[in-house]
């Protein structure tokens, strides 16, 4: 059997001979030198060279624990004159013994942090964190202990965890934002002779919401012409504040002023300005002069510095409406007037007023905008604003007339206003009622009295208030000795009916009816209309046949049971 | 050259005995171990044991005790091997190698010797 | 005595075809070695100490194993690897040898 114990090996020897390591030793072993003793395995016929007949173990170059702390070999042995193994293949190791020669190394060379300003002392800052690469189970030489040697007395370190504190009170970023603290790792617990490594930690003081805004003057004044629109800014102002992002953000407020409803204030994200916009419609006639009071405030407030007083300041801001000179302005948004249809010329409709707001109160004339009055029906009276006709109306054509009507300061003719007129054109009544259709119709020749053969509709162009109400009858050189009769049905309609019995279409082939169609109105309107009855053949189901020799032209949908 | 040259092949009847050559050239004979090996016709390899040269020390597979004697004559640097009471199951190529490990390990192998056994 | 099983007894490769023979031991030995025979010929040294290639042995040709499971691989099977390969042991007397495998080309 093998017979070895475990090897060990000082790390970087530096002596001029092969540093001796140990000896591989087989029990079989006679000492004739005829065992071959064979290394393979990490660094073996290169870090290290055996002996093959003794069996001694030397390293040929200086080794770094550091770099590679154990060696695993594999050892054999095996008889020359046999070529056999007199024992198995067995593995070893070297372990390489640790000297203290690396110094601490720092995990950063340098170390960025942030700590908020005005922290108590000791507020954890960071923790820097140096390695030693020599053996942390075998002496001091990996036992770092930390010291600042640049930073004081506004930081100290922990020596044994490299924790970086605050250590002064009221560190004010807006004092001072940066320091560069410089901190040492020592190895040998800190003792002389130890190795040492020095890293760099740069720490900003990160800010805090320790300093309110403030307005750099108590005063402002802007101008606007009476005419901006609500939303037109009109001037901005602006509070400064030392603190920066989120603590430097400021909210603007109007808090009290005249101006408290006609102004709003609106806070600019991007450059922490408040701009003063219009809220309503402003009048210069009606007040020249508005004074606010706005309040700049931080709208996040750090509890622990309410004692350094209110996060807010306020500034006066006055505001001086300017002049503008205005349109006219007419009485109403929209004028509706009414006309009968049958009115004369120059009948007047009505009025329309605009007058000039300005403190001036510059006089106004009157036109009609032609664009919207093409036929020059209407006309006004430039100096009052009276409306009148110019033209006969007809109801029947053109029920409403828009128009609109200009009203222009004398002075100075750029400032007109519009406004539209609706005129309404009232029925007069004018027209005649009509049949409401041509009515020819038919008898047949076998026909019993009292037939209805048709029935009768009329139209009126009018428009009575009431309703249409029509009457029907024959006209009196017709009245007498006809053969038909005419029927008023009080409903708008009337039948034609047959007074004989029986006709004969050779004797009398056509007759023609005529008929009296009244309206009901003031002054009453009638006309005449004919119908024309043919004299037809027809079957005992009372369907025509044939007439005369013209042909008829047979209204749809007509009973010929009639 | 290393060479292991092996006497020819021998014909022999049941129950006689045959004494086989290996003589060496090439390399130190009394340096490694002479190995003797049968293989029988078709079949797998059998070692049947070695000497050593030096002081003609022996060792032998128990299967073959009684049936090989090894012996050396170190001055014509010749191994031989003597079978006896041979049987049918006797008839095999026999053959002499020598392995050891020098700068490395080799193994050499003679021509092999063929021995019938039949009546 | 230590039992060499080898498997499988005959196989055959094509060229370029990797190929992996076992060697298998009744009880643990500490190394084996392994012998390339072609017909008409003697035993040829082939691996030594598990894993060692004998001299003028292919690149191509690997031994591996431990206790009681050894192999032998060829990479890339060539014309001339056609052969029977055993295996033996030399850890216990008797020094036994493996029945063969027997390698073919396709």
């Known amino acids: 059997s093998w017979m070895w114990n475990q090897f060990f090996l000082l790390e970087e020897y530096t002596g001029s001979d092969y540093q001796y390591v140990g000896k591989l030793h087989s029990d079989q072993d006679r000492g004739d030198g005829s065992l071959k003793y064979i290394l393979s395995g990490d660094g073996a016929g290169d870090l290290f060279i055996i002996n093959e007949n003794t069996g001694d173990i030397q390293a040929t170059k200086r080794l770094d624990r550091e770099e590679k702390p154990v060696y695993i070999l594999r050892a054999q042995a095996i008889n020359r004159r046999t070529g056999r193994p007199v024992e198995p293949e067995s593995e070893f190791i070297i372990k390489i013994h640790d000297i203290n020669d690396n110094e601490p190394i720092f995990t950063k060379e340098v170390y960025t942090a942030t700590v908020p300003e005005m922290s108590d002392v000791g507020t954890f800052v960071v923790q820097v964190t140096a390695t030693d690469a020599d053996d942390p189970t075998y002496g001091n030489s990996a036992k770092v202990v930390y010291s600042i040697l640049q930073g004081q007395p506004y930081f100290s370190v922990e020596s044994e965890t490299g924790i970086i504190k605050t250590a002064l009170l009221n560190m004010d970023r807006e004092n001072r934002e940066q320091y560069q603290v410089v901190i040492q790792a020592k190895d040998m617990g800190g003792q002389m002779g130890g190795l040492s490594g020095t890293t760099t930690v740069n720490i900003t003081l990160t800010d805090v919401n320790d300093n309110p805004p403030r307005f750099p003057q108590s005063t402002y004044q802007f101008k606007t012409p009476e005419s901006s629109p609500p939303g037109t800014p009109i001037g901005r102002i602006k509070a400064s504040d030392a603190d920066v992002g989120e603590n430097a953000e400021i909210e603007y407020s109007i808090t009290d002023g005249e101006g408290l409803d006609m102004f709003d204030v609106i806070t600019d994200q991007e450059t922490q300005e408040g701009i003063i916009t219009v809220k309503k419609l402003l009048d210069f006639e009606k007040k020249k002069v508005y004074t606010l009071k706005v309040e700049a405030s931080n709208p996040y407030v750090e509890p622990r510095f309410l004692y350094l007083g209110p996060f807010k300041d306020s500034a006066t801001v006055r505001i001086v409406v300017e002049d503008v000179d205005e349109p006219p302005v007419f009485s109403k948004l929209a004028y509706i007037l009414q006309i009968r249809e049958d009115a004369q010329i120059n009948t007047t409709i009505g009025s329309v007023t605009a007058q000039d707001p300005d403190a001036a109160r510059n006089p106004v004339k009157y036109s009609v905008d032609r664009h919207t009055d093409m036929d020059r029906i209407f006309n006004i009276d430039s100096g009052n604003g009276s409306i009148f006709t110019s033209k006969l109306l007809d109801r029947e054509t053109l029920l409403w007339h828009n128009i609109t009507v200009i009203a222009t300061e004398i002075n100075n003719p750029k400032q007109s206003s519009r406004v539209p007129l609706y005129i309404k054109v009232l029925d007069v009544n004018d027209n005649a009622p009509e049949f409401a259709e041509f009515y020819e119709t038919f008898v047949c020749e076998k026909a019993k009295a009292d037939q209805l053969i048709q029935t009768l509709h009329a139209v009126d162009k009018d428009d009575p208030y009431s309703g249409h109400q029509f009457s029907f009858s024959l006209a009196p050189e017709a009245a007498s000795g006809s053969n038909f009769t005419i029927q008023d049905n009080k409903d708008n309609t009337a039948g034609i009916l047959t007074r004989k019995n029986g006709y004969n279409r050779h004797e009398m082939s056509t007759y023609l009816l005529p008929v009296v169609i009244s309206d009901n109105d003031y002054p009453v309107q009638s006309s005449t209309g004919t119908v024309t009855v043919r004299v037809c053949a027809c079957d005992h189901h009372g369907n025509m046949q044939s007439c005369h020799a013209e042909a008829l032209i047979h209204p749809t949908g007509l009973s010929t049971g009639a | 050259e290393v060479q292991l040259q092996q006497s020819g092949p021998e014909l022999v009847k049941p129950g006689a005995s045959v004494r086989i050559s290996c003589k060496a050239s090439g390399y130190t004979f009394t340096d490694y171990y002479m190995n003797w090996v049968k293989q029988s016709h078709g079949k797998s390899l059998e070692w049947i044991g070695d000497i050593d040269p030096n002081n003609a020390n022996t060792t032998y597979n128990q299967k073959f005790k009684g049936k090989a004697t090894l012996t050396v004559d170190k001055s014509s640097s010749t191994a031989y091997m003597e079978l006896r009471s041979l049987t049918s199951e006797d008839s095999a190529v026999y053959s002499c190698?020598?392995?050891?490990?020098?700068?490395?390990?080799?193994?050499?192998w003679g021509q092999g010797t063929l021995v019938t056994v039949s009546a | 005595q230590i039992v060499l099983t080898q498997s499988p007894a005959l196989m055959s490769a094509s060229p370029g075809e990797k190929v992996t023979m076992t060697c298998s031991a009744s009880?643990?030995?500490?190394?084996m070695y392994w012998y390339q025979q072609k017909p008409r010929s003697s035993p040829k040294p082939w691996i030594y100490l598990t894993s060692n290639l004998a001299s003028g042995v292919p690149a191509r040709f690997s031994g591996s194993g431990s206790g009681t499971s050894y192999s032998l691989t060829i990479s890339s099977m060539e014309a001339e690897d056609a052969a029977t390969y055993y295996c033996?042991?030399?850890?216990?007397?008797?020094?036994?040898f493996g029945s063969g495998t027997k390698l073919e080309i396709k």
């Open positions: 190698a020598s392995f050891g490990y020098d700068v490395e390990w080799f193994g050499y």
């Open positions: 009880s643990s030995v500490s190394y």
């Open positions: 033996q042991q030399w850890s216990s007397n008797p020094f036994t």
